[in-house]
């Protein structure tokens, strides 16, 4: 969770306690295990047609 007193991160970014700054959620594609990725919106579920062809 974000550190107390920190300004909220802008849309598309999330607070990293490890790095002590807001980080782009886009980087979770390359580094999905980063702490801040937990705060990024989960990818929408695949359409039913992809799950059950």
């Amino acid at each position: 969770e974000q550190a107390p007193g920190q300004a909220p991160c802008s849309r598309g970014s999330s607070w990293s306690a490890d790095l002590d700054k807001c980080m782009d959620c886009a980087s979770c594609r390359a580094r999905p295990h980063s702490d801040f990725c937990l705060g990024c919106a989960a990818a929408p579920p695949a359409p039913f047609r992809l799950l059950w062809p």
Epitope: L19, A26, R29, A30, R31
Partner: antibody, heavy 119, light 111 residues
Framework: QVELVESGGGLVQPGGSLRLSCAAS????????MSWVRQAPGKGLEWVAE??????????HYAESVKGRFTISRDDSKNSLYLQMNSLRAEDTAVYYC??????????WGQGTLVTVSS | DIQMTQSPSSLSASVGDRVTITCRAS??????????MHWYQQKPGKAPKLLIK???NLESGVPSRFSGSGSGTDFTLTISSLQPEDFATYYC?????????FGGGTKVEIK
Amino acid sequence: QVELVESGGGLVQPGGSLRLSCAASGFTFSSYWMSWVRQAPGKGLEWVAEIRLKSDNYATHYAESVKGRFTISRDDSKNSLYLQMNSLRAEDTAVYYCTGYYADAMDYWGQGTLVTVSS
Amino acid sequence: DIQMTQSPSSLSASVGDRVTITCRASQSVSTSSYSYMHWYQQKPGKAPKLLIKYASNLESGVPSRFSGSGSGTDFTLTISSLQPEDFATYYCQHSWEIPYTFGGGTKVEIK
């Protein structure tokens, strides 16, 4: 503030070797991917090599043009990045930049070190 | 490898002009959520500087006259009102896959 300082450039004969170093400060070096990017005189930017993290077993990637000749490495205890360049060719003549990034976009750049390969 | 084609390769403009630089990738570098395209500025004798990442995210400290847009294969860097310090060469770069590749650059010169 973030600082990347390259060293080790110079004049070398074709077929020779050179080792570049990059000293990093001002950011959590061990958490950042690192690359070397070069720029031939009057030309554009070319990515050369990348090294990832200890948690990635220090995975490395290379441009085809340097594969088998160049080796990238890092020493997290010294906040340092290296590029061992062997079998150098005239076309390797360039300014070599050390870059640091969490992923994707190269946030941090050094001032560059010039490598000249000539007889 | 993904090829990056920048245009124009050079342009002449005056202070206050609106400047647009385009970059086309040989294949898509976007997901449904994000585009893996970045823009850099380089002044003579200096290292490149990151301006915009993920197509449209302005790097901290970069003036708001710079903006980026696009998705898929076509991307644009816009300088809304060119300032004297903006005369430089601009490069796009993708991070979709290895190898990372840069565009050939666009040199913005004084008219």
